[in-house]
Interface confidence: low
C-alpha cells in the first residue's frame, strides 16, 4: 500500500449560539495534523498560540490591525449573518419521528423479552422516550442505543424495555419531540398470538 | 451553559494526496460542501439550495491558502507526519426492517484520520455500486473525522451485506456485516 507520510492542515471557524443569537462565541481554530496550533476566541479577543508551533502565527496576526478587527467583528459579520441565512432550514427544521414497537424476538407470554421502541427519521435530535406499563412509567430495565445521527439530517434511536409480558398487559412507548405539540404514543398489547398488528 | 447550536466552517488540505475539502456543518450535519473539481456548491439536502446560496469560488481561494499554510507548517514541524488513527465502523439500517420493504443500509465510519478511506458495499460477497451514496468527510470535536456511506436495499432472508473499509490505520480491510434478523411479530402502531 501507499505508506508515504501524510501531513494535514485543518482550519475550523466555529460559531456557538446561546439563546438564539443573543450570545455568540466565535472561534477561529487551526490544526496541524490532529493538534491545535493557534486560535482566535471572541471571548478572549486576540489570537493565542495553543502549541509552540502556532506562536509565529499568533504574533503575526495580532500585529495586523485589519486581521484582528475582522476576527473581532466575526460574531456579527460572520456568525449572526450565517445564522440568519440558514435559520429557516436548520434551526427551525422539524421532522416528526416514526414510532414502531415490536418485541425483539418471538416469544410466548411469560418469557423474558425485550420490547423495542424504534423512533426513526426525526429532526432535531432532542427527544424523550418513555415506557409505560398499564399507564405506569417503567424506569427500570430500560436500555437505549442513545441518539444515532444518520448523516442525512435525521436521527434515530432504539429504546428497549426488558420485560416478561403477561396476557392483558398494555405497554406504551411515549415519545416527546419538538415536532409535535403532544406526545406520540404507540401501544403494544401482550396477547397469546405470536403475530400482533393493529 | 451548553450552546444551543454550532455552525462550523470546516476545511482541510492533505499532502501528498493534494486533496482538500471545504464544508459547512450545523450541529453535526453537513449543510453543504464545495466540489473542488466541478467548482460548485453541493447542498446536502436539495431543498437547502432554495433558501440560500454560497459562492464556490471563495472556497477554492481558501483551499489555495490552506495548501500554502500546510507547506509552511510541515516545514515548521520539521516534517512531523500525522499518526494514523483507524476508524470504528458500524452498519445499521435507516429504519426498522421489514422484509421486501425498501430500506437503507448505513455504514458509519467514525473516529479516524487522515481523511482518506476506501469503502465498498458487498452483497453476498460481491461489490454493489447501484444506488450507493456517501457524505464528504465530516469534522468531529476531537478533530478526527466521520463519514457515512449509504446503500438502498430490499431486505430479504437470502441476502447478506458487508461494508468493507480500508484505511492506513488498519492492518487489513475491516468488514462489518449485516443480515436480516429472525422475524418478530408485526409492529404495533396506535392512534
Amino acid at each position: 500500500g501507499d505508506t508515504r507520510p501524510r501531513f494535514l492542515w485543518q482550519p475550523k471557524r466555529e460559531c456557538h449560539f446561546f439563546n438564539g443569537t443573543e450570545r455568540v462565541r466565535f472561534l477561529d481554530r487551526y490544526f496541524y495534523n490532529q493538534e491545535e496550533s493557534v486560535r482566535f476566541d471572541s471571548d478572549v479577543g486576540e489570537f493565542r498560540a495553543v502549541t509552540e508551533l502556532g506562536r509565529p502565527d499568533a504574533e503575526y496576526w495580532n500585529s495586523q490591525k485589519d486581521i484582528l478587527e475582522q476576527a473581532r467583528a466575526a460574531v456579527d459579520t460572520y456568525c449572526r449573518h450565517n445564522y440568519g441565512v440558514g435559520e429557516s432550514f436548520t434551526v427551525q427544521r422539524r421532522v416528526q419521528p416514526k414510532v414502531t414497537v415490536y418485541p425483539s424476538k418471538t416469544q410466548p407470554l411469560q418469557h423474558h423479552n425485550l420490547l423495542v421502541c424504534s423512533v426513526s427519521g426525526f429532526y432535531p435530535g432532542s427527544i424523550e422516550v418513555r415506557w409505560f406499563l398499564n399507564g405506569q412509567e417503567e424506569k427500570a430495565g430500560m436500555v437505549s442505543t442513545g441518539l444515532i445521527q444518520n448523516g442525512d439530517w435525521t436521527f434515530q434511536t432504539l429504546v428497549m424495555l426488558e420485560t416478561v409480558p403477561r396476557s392483558g398487559e398494555v405497554y406504551t412507548c411515549q415519545v416527546e419531540h419538538p415536532s409535535v405539540t403532544s406526545p406520540l404514543t404507540v401501544e403494544w398489547r401482550a396477547r397469546s398470538e405470536s403475530a400482533q398488528s393493529k | 451553559i451548553k450552546e444551543e447550536h454550532v455552525i462550523i466552517q470546516a476545511e482541510f488540505y492533505l499532502n501528498p494526496d493534494q486533496s482538500g475539502e471545504f464544508m459547512f456543518d450545523f450541529d453535526g450535519d453537513e449543510i453543504f460542501h464545495v466540489d473542488m473539481a466541478k467548482k460548485e456548491t453541493v447542498w446536502r439536502l436539495e431543498e437547502f439550495g432554495r433558501f440560500a446560496s454560497f459562492e464556490a469560488q471563495g472556497a477554492l481561494a481558501n483551499i489555495a491558502v490552506d495548501k500554502a499554510n500546510l507547506e509552511i507548517m510541515t516545514k515548521r514541524s520539521n516534517y512531523t507526519p500525522i499518526t494514523n488513527v483507524p476508524p470504528e465502523v458500524t452498519v445499521l439500517t435507516n429504519s426498522p426492517v421489514e422484509l421486501r420493504e425498501p430500506n437503507v443500509l448505513i455504514c458509519f465510519i467514525d473516529k479516524f484520520t487522515p481523511p482518506v478511506v476506501n469503502v465498498t458495499w458487498l452483497r453476498n460477497g460481491k461489490p454493489v455500486t447501484t444506488g450507493v451514496s456517501e457524505t464528504v468527510f465530516l469534522p468531529r470535536e476531537d478533530h478526527l473525522f466521520r463519514k457515512f456511506h449509504y446503500l438502498p436495499f430490499l431486505p430479504s432472508t437470502e441476502d447478506v451485506y458487508d461494508c468493507r473499509v480500508e484505511h492506513w490505520g488498519l492492518d487489513e480491510p475491516l468488514l462489518k456485516h449485516w443480515e436480516f434478523d429472525a422475524p418478530s411479530p408485526l409492529p404495533e402502531t396506535t392512534e
Epitope: Q96, K98, V99, S179, S182 | E101, L186, T189, T190, E191
Partner: antibody, heavy 120, light 109 residues
C-alpha cells in the same frame, strides 16, 4: 370508533373546480403513521387512487392527475380537503376518503362515498 | 391508469375454493405489501387482507392472501353466496398507491 364521511357538491359543471371534504372521527391525523387518502370509482368501473396526506403533512398524488389535485388537512377540525380542477364528464364517479393507519399501510376504514356528476 | 392486472371475473359453486390473481411488477408488488378489498354491490370497499396475508379482525379465515415475486393472490375457501362481490388488489409504486382493475366473483347456483 373510526368513522369517515365525504361531503361536497353532487353536481359540477365541466371546467369547474371540485372541492370535497372528508370529516373523520375516532382517530387523529397528528398520530405518527396515520394518513388519509382519496379514491374514486366511476360507475361500473374500478377503484382509482387519487391522493393521500400523511400525519406529517407529506402529500402524494396520482401520477396521471397530480397537476389537477391538491390535498390538505386541518388537524384541529379532523378534516381533509381534496380539490380537483378542470372537471370533465369522465370525472363522474363516487369519491371515497379512507384512513391508512400506518405509513404505507392499507386503507382500513372507508367513508360511504359521495357521487359527483359532471354535467352541463 | 391501472397498474395491477386482475382477471375481470371468476366464479365458483357454494363450498368451492376460488383464487383471484393480481399481477404487477418489481417496483410495486415486488417491493411492497399487497392489500385486498371486498366491495359488495352498492357499498364502500372493505379491507379484507393487508400486508400480503394478514386478516383484520372480523374477516373469516376462509379468506387468505399470499404473495410471490411480482404476483399476489386471494384465496376464498368454502364459498358462500354472500361472497359475491368485486375484489380489488392494491399495492404501492414509488409512493403512489395503485389498485388492480377489480375481479367480479359470481357464486353459482
Amino acid at each position: 370508533q373510526v368513522q369517515l364521511k365525504e361531503s361536497g357538491p353532487a353536481l359540477v359543471k365541466p371546467t369547474q373546480t371540485l372541492t370535497l371534504t372528508c370529516t373523520f372521527s375516532g382517530f387523529s391525523l397528528s398520530t405518527s403513521g396515520v394518513g388519509v387518502g382519496w379514491i374514486r370509482q366511476p360507475p361500473g368501473k374500478a377503484l382509482e387512487w387519487l391522493a393521500l396526506i400523511d400525519w406529517d403533512d407529506d402529500k402524494y398524488y396520482s401520477t396521471s392527475l397530480k397537476t389537477r389535485l391538491t390535498i390538505s388537512k386541518d388537524t384541529s377540525k379532523n378534516q381533509v380537503v381534496l380539490t380537483m380542477t378542470n372537471m370533465d364528464p369522465v370525472d363522474t364517479a363516487t369519491y371515497y376518503c379512507a384512513r391508512s393507519p400506518r405509513y404505507r399501510g392499507a386503507f382500513d376504514y372507508w367513508g360511504q362515498g359521495t357521487l359527483v356528476t359532471v354535467s352541463s | 391508469d391501472i397498474v395491477l392486472t386482475q382477471p375481470p371475473s371468476v366464479s365458483g359453486a357454494p363450498g368451492q375454493r376460488v383464487t383471484i390473481s393480481c399481477s404487477g411488477s418489481e417496483s410495486n408488488i415486488g417491493n411492497n405489501y399487497v392489500q385486498w378489498y371486498q366491495q359488495l354491490p352498492g357499498t364502500a370497499p372493505k379491507l379484507l387482507i393487508y400486508d400480503n396475508n394478514q386478516r383484520p379482525s372480523g374477516v373469516p379465515d376462509r379468506f387468505s392472501g399470499s404473495k410471490s415475486g411480482t404476483s399476489a393472490s386471494l384465496a376464498i375457501t368454502g364459498l358462500q353466496s354472500e361472497d359475491e362481490a368485486d375484489y380489488y388488489c392494491q399495492s404501492y409504486d414509488m409512493n403512489v398507491h395503485v389498485f388492480g382493475g377489480g375481479t367480479k366473483l359470481t357464486v353459482l347456483g
